[in-house]
Amino acid sequence: FGISGRHSITVTTVASAGNIGEDGILSCTFEPDIKLSDIVIQWLKEGVLGLVHEFKEGKDELSEQDEMFRGRTAVFADQVIVGNASLRLKNVQLTDAGTYKCYIITSKGKGNANLEYKTGAFSMPEVNV
């Protein structure tokens, strides 16, 4: 898989929060490509050397996944072709909080965006009338 490295594509993320013990979503979108096989998604976390998640050639590639995320991540594979690189994080842990990078490579070029992910015990406020 080769790209010049000189072209950049637009990648957009949204800061979000996850409830400990529940599933969370790290949102990321990008300029879509025509061919799914030309899209690479890499999720990284600040200070962690292994990957959070990698998706390439139309499927997950988890050989370089960091141990702390093993078995807990997934992308929405059927939505990658339309530019959705969001990550589903299962069983959110307190230690999942931090800065993440969504890194995208397509035939058009590459791009990335960071997002802050907060974790905690959040609850919906009750409204009494």
């Epitope: 898989f1 490295g5 990078k101 890194y103 590459k110």
Partner: antibody
Amino acid sequence: EVQLLESGGGLVQPGGSLRLSCAASGFTFNTHAMHWVRQAPGKGLEWVSAISGSGGSTYYADSVKGRFTISRDISKNTLYLQMNSLRAEDTAVYYCARLLGRFGEYGMDVWGQGTTVTVSS
Amino acid sequence: DIQMTQSPSSLSASVGDRVTITCRASRSIYTWLAWYQQKPGKAPKLLIYDASTLQSGVPSRFSGSGSGTDFTLTISSLQPEDFATYYCQQSYSTPYTFGGGTKVEIK
């Protein structure tokens, strides 16, 4: 000024132990992954070990796995390498190095001056 | 483990020459590649990261290119202070691995 200063090297017999330290200053220590890299006399660079910014994840070269332990004390801004069951082939200059940026995909931008470990009887 | 093969292992060049060093990874590392310069008795110095990004303070005569498995470090006009050993290093996969080094000597 961003600085790394190693200490703890010396002469040790085969089978012995040493603990290397790397004192960091001038940057936020707990946001950077840190590495140990070594260089045997007249040889090239060999990556030894690394630790995540939080200290929660550690990584080792196969040649040192089970013998070396990397750790960090964020309160002291110090990185450590505990080396046990030392062998002659562990003889090298040991460098600590900081990961550039906050993620794993870049190189090592700040290096210490190195500390020499000699394993010999 | 990913193997990094650097070539040549040594070269002789003159001041003002254009010098090219290549590095090949045993499998794709995208652009997760750095280049270092090391002088005798000194710690390595980061020159290039992300395959082609020049580290702050490094002269613009140094440039990097490539992605996937094949990478190049180019010194456009060799200066006296550039005589040193150069290493490539991949950071896509642990264990991180270095190339064997290229010693640039004075012709």
